[in-house]
């Protein structure tokens, strides 16, 4: 309510997210991700839940395939509100590779840069969303150690849709994935049957990323 | 802003060849699968085949395996169709549109959200 | 492959009213994969829904799609003058697509 006593529009929290994160969100845009809708259906359940803002949470979102483009930084919006306008406006970039490892390691060297928003002394969480065994899972222990060496807080969540619609064994993709996690795994890694279900993990995630506030 | 710009009609004889275009722009073309859809005069949609740029990765309908050639050129971002011989059968509109979904592993899904604006090809 | 017969094949209504377009597949259509296009006369078919009910970009809300397994529903509230077209769904679910002959939503 204004101070004239009129309805503003705006959009509360569902659980306030008050303590300072900033939160960079590894999507994989593949074709095989399908459908997109579903991803941004997500981001919005996700980001409604937080309180953004420069002196708050800060959300940056960076979208890989075949290569990496930064969709927005963590300082660009400055509210909830338009963030979640930014989010709904991604679109899939497409391509067949799942350059996973060069997602995540994009993020770290580029996303949590303090050119791009990033704060000294906040506590810095990365989720990567992915459908697909990563082509470059060569490089994935390293960057996951740098990622470990820079006290990033990983959540990662295995969508296994391409391999039910395939009739394919999940067992390497989400072995592959679970790696990809912070420690305990089980806090921090999620699975989903397919891109539909995404936004059935929404509170908990959320819950568990609000969790590391504490 | 994502289109699809087809080549323009044709009028050929039967037995001869023929190829048509469908060039993309406003997304990375390299990126999405392009497929290939025939509507005979007065009739229904039919899917052809698709093609992923990027690699030239072809697949075919059963019913036109064998009749027509889908092929790609990723430099100017070009899907083809072609045919080496004409018949009389072959006159109908054909239509490019891009596929958003997939097509790897041997499991293909996914619907087609933006379309060419179609190629009249007439054979008598 | 999955045959798809679409019902009735021509409807005849006024606009305003309400069309309700079926498409009917000879085997289940898994994960719901079916999507509904329009096509005009002269014109390439248009995207209006795809994954049985979810509104492509830029469709006006008076477009809804409903069913899964192996019956499917295109439901038009209020027939606006530029509605009356041909609308075909499709199939996707089976490693090759697959088209319904066509509803032909005419003018009464």
């Known amino acids: 309510v204004s101070p004239t006593f009129q309805v503003v529009n705006s959009i509360a929290p569902v659980q306030e997210c008050s303590t300072q994160l900033d939160i960079v969100i590894v999507l994989d845009g593949s074709n095989s991700i399908y459908p997109w809708d579903s991803v941004t259906a997500f981001l919005n359940d996700l980001l409604k839940r937080m309180d953004i803002g420069p002196k708050q949470t800060q959300v940056g979102i960076v979208q890989y395939g075949e290569n990496v483009t930064h969709e927005f930084n963590l300082n660009k919006y400055s509210s909830t509100e338009e963030v979640l306008v930014a989010a709904k406006k991604i679109v899939q970039r497409g391509g067949r590779q799942t350059m996973t490892a060069l997602g995540i390691d994009t993020a770290r060297k580029e996303a949590f840069t303090e050119a791009r928003g990033a704060r000294r002394g906040v506590k810095k969480v990365m989720v990567i969303v992915t459908d697909g065994e990563s082509h470059d899972n060569h490089r994935l222990k390293k960057v996951i150690q740098d990622c470990e060496d820079e006290n990033i807080q990983r959540f990662s969540i295995a969508i296994l849709g391409s391999y039910n619609r395939g009739n394919l064994s999940t067992e390497k993709f989400v072995e592959e994935i679970k790696s990809i996690a912070s420690e305990p795994t089980e806090k921090h890694f999620f699975n989903v049957s397919d891109e539909l279900a995404l936004v059935t993990i929404v509170k908990t995630l959320g819950e568990r990323i609000f969790a590391l506030e504490a | 802003e994502v289109q699809l710009v087809q080549s323009g009609a044709e009028v050929k004889k039967p037995g001869e060849s023929l190829r048509i275009s469908c060039k993309g722009s406003?997304?990375?073309?390299?990126?999405?699968?392009i497929g290939w859809v025939r509507q005979m005069p007065g009739k229904g949609l039919e899917w052809m085949g698709i093609?992923?740029?990027?690699?030239?990765?072809?697949r075919y309908s059963p019913s036109f395996q064998g009749q027509v050639t889908i092929s790609a050129d990723k430099s100017i971002s070009t899907a083809y169709l072609q045919w080496s011989s004409l018949k009389a059968s072959d006159t109908a509109m054909y239509y490019c549109a891009r596929l958003q979904g997939d097509c790897s592993g041997g499991t293909c899904y996914g619907h087609f959200d933006y379309w060419g604006q179609g190629t009249l090809v007439t054979v008598s | 492959e999955i045959v798809l017969t679409q019902s009735p094949g021509t409807l005849s209504l006024s606009p305003g009213e309400r069309a309700t377009l079926s498409c009917r597949a000879s085997q289940s259509v898994s994960s719901s994969y079916l999507a509904w296009y329009q096509q005009k006369p002269a014109q390439a078919p248009r995207l209006l829904i795809y994954v049985a009910s979810r509104r492509a970009t830029g469709i006006p809300d008076r477009f809804s799609g409903s069913g899964s397994g192996t019956d499917f529903t295109l439901t038009i509230s209020r027939l606006e003058p530029e509605d009356f077209a041909v609308y075909y769904c499709q199939q996707y679910g089976t490693s090759s697509w697959t088209f319904g002959q066509g509803t032909t939503v005419e003018i009464k």
């Open positions: 406003g997304y990375s073309v390299t990126s999405y699968w």
């Open positions: 093609i992923y740029p990027g690699d030239s990765d072809t």
